[in-house]
Amino acid sequence: LNTTVLQGMAGQSLRVSCTYDALKHWGRRKAWCRQLGEEGPCQRVVSTHGVWLLAFLKKRNGSTVIADDTLAGTVTITLKNLQAGDAGLYQCQSLRGREAEVLQKVLVEVLEDPLDDQDAGDLWVPEESSSFEGAQVEHSTSRNQETSFPPTS
């Protein structure tokens, strides 16, 4: 599975959108987890509402928010007030019992604001108004890693 690299500015919000086959993943909750090391386990950060039909409701854990549009097949994760410590490898997952299927691998990179408190122009987006999409500077790196469907114990 290819890894998508998303860059966000420190102090701002970074929004990650993971798309999936809505029929294939019907009835399955979604989760956002942080991978501990290249081959390590993926530590759950936040998952969608326990009642699948309410998955559109935002669930928050700390500064991370998740919501799932189950009809469109898009789960959206927002990392608010991005900090240097948020950088790392993450996964969007589709859950089924003790199994977790990787929908997308995401490498989050945090950029320090080179202008400090000065006007950052088009790149600086106040958190209140909208999220820094990351897609503006998104690129993919092919890692040719197979999608796995391991138990999440």
């Epitope: 009835g27 399955r28 089924r96 003790r98």
Partner: antibody, heavy 123, light 107 residues
Framework: EVQLVQSGAEVKKPGESLKISCKGS????????IGWVRQMPGKGLEWMGI????????RYSPSFQGQVTISADKSISTAYLQWSSLKASDTAMYYC????????????????WGQGTMVTVSS | EIVLTQSPATLSLSPGERATLSCRAS??????LAWYQQKPGQAPRLLIY???KRATGIPARFSGSGSGTDFTLTISSLEPEDFAVYYC?????????FGGGTKVEIK
């Protein structure tokens, strides 16, 4: 009527290749997972693997990984099970079955089964 | 992989009697357990899924119970057509293994 129709019985020699089929009808073939199950003569059921025809996402039981290939052609609503080099121990009845229940709150329920394909491998 | 152990291997009963079949998992499978019936020369048929939910068209005399590692399939009053082999299957963790089966035969 929802049904899975499998290809006919096969008699093969060791070392030969084989591809058996399972054609779905009466439902949206691409929206349900299809599992394959082996039953050796006089024995129980063995799980081989599962495929989602919508995108050909496939999972194998470790016992069958590398021994068989599971595939699907969604354009003709057909799933396949194939061997590149058959062994006498592959002699068995092979079933395909639809996973009608398979989500976060519901376990796998193979609710529609094919009639089975008997594969005999003998020199 | 998860191992399912069914007991007894054979159950000899008369029509009208109650049949109790057991399936034990080597580790918890939550309620992700299904039961199938297979008659000679036929494909298996789904009876119960999610440990206790009857599949479409299955008579009320078939019931399932249990969660975690211990499960039971009960046939409240055996009909002549119920004499067959019964298999449990877990779908908690892939591979979705089957139990070895319990044969319910006429006494």
């Amino acid at each position: 009527e929802v049904q899975l129709v499998q290809s006919g019985a096969e008699v093969k020699k060791p070392g030969e290749s084989l591809k058996i089929s399972c054609k779905g009808s009466g439902y949206s073939f691409t929206s349900y997972w299809i599992g394959w199950v082996r039953q050796m003569p006089g024995k129980g059921l063995e799980w081989m693997g599962i495929i989602y025809p919508g995108d050909s996402d496939t999972r194998y039981s470790p016992s069958f990984q590398g021994q068989v290939t599971i595939s699907a052609d969604k354009s003709i609503s057909t799933a396949y099970l194939q061997w590149s080099s058959l062994k006498a121990s592959d002699t068995a009845m092979y079933y395909c079955a639809r996973a009608g229940h398979y989500d976060d709150w519901s376990g796998l329920g193979l609710d529609v089964w094919g009639q089975g394909t008997m594969v005999t491998v003998s020199s | 992989e998860i191992v399912l152990t069914q007991s007894p291997a054979t159950l000899s009963l008369s029509p009208g009697e109650r049949a109790t079949l057991s399936c034990r998992a080597s580790q918890s499978v939550s309620s992700y357990l299904a039961w199938y019936q297979q008659k000679p020369g036929q494909a298996p048929r789904l009876l119960i899924y999610d440990a206790s939910k009857r599949a479409t068209g299955i008579p009320a005399r078939f019931s399932g119970s249990g969660s975690g590692t211990d499960f039971t399939l009960t046939i409240s009053s055996l009909e002549p057509e119920d004499f067959a082999v019964y298999y449990c299957q877990q779908s908690s963790v892939h591979p979705y293994t089957f139990g070895g089966g319990t044969k319910v035969e006429i006494k």
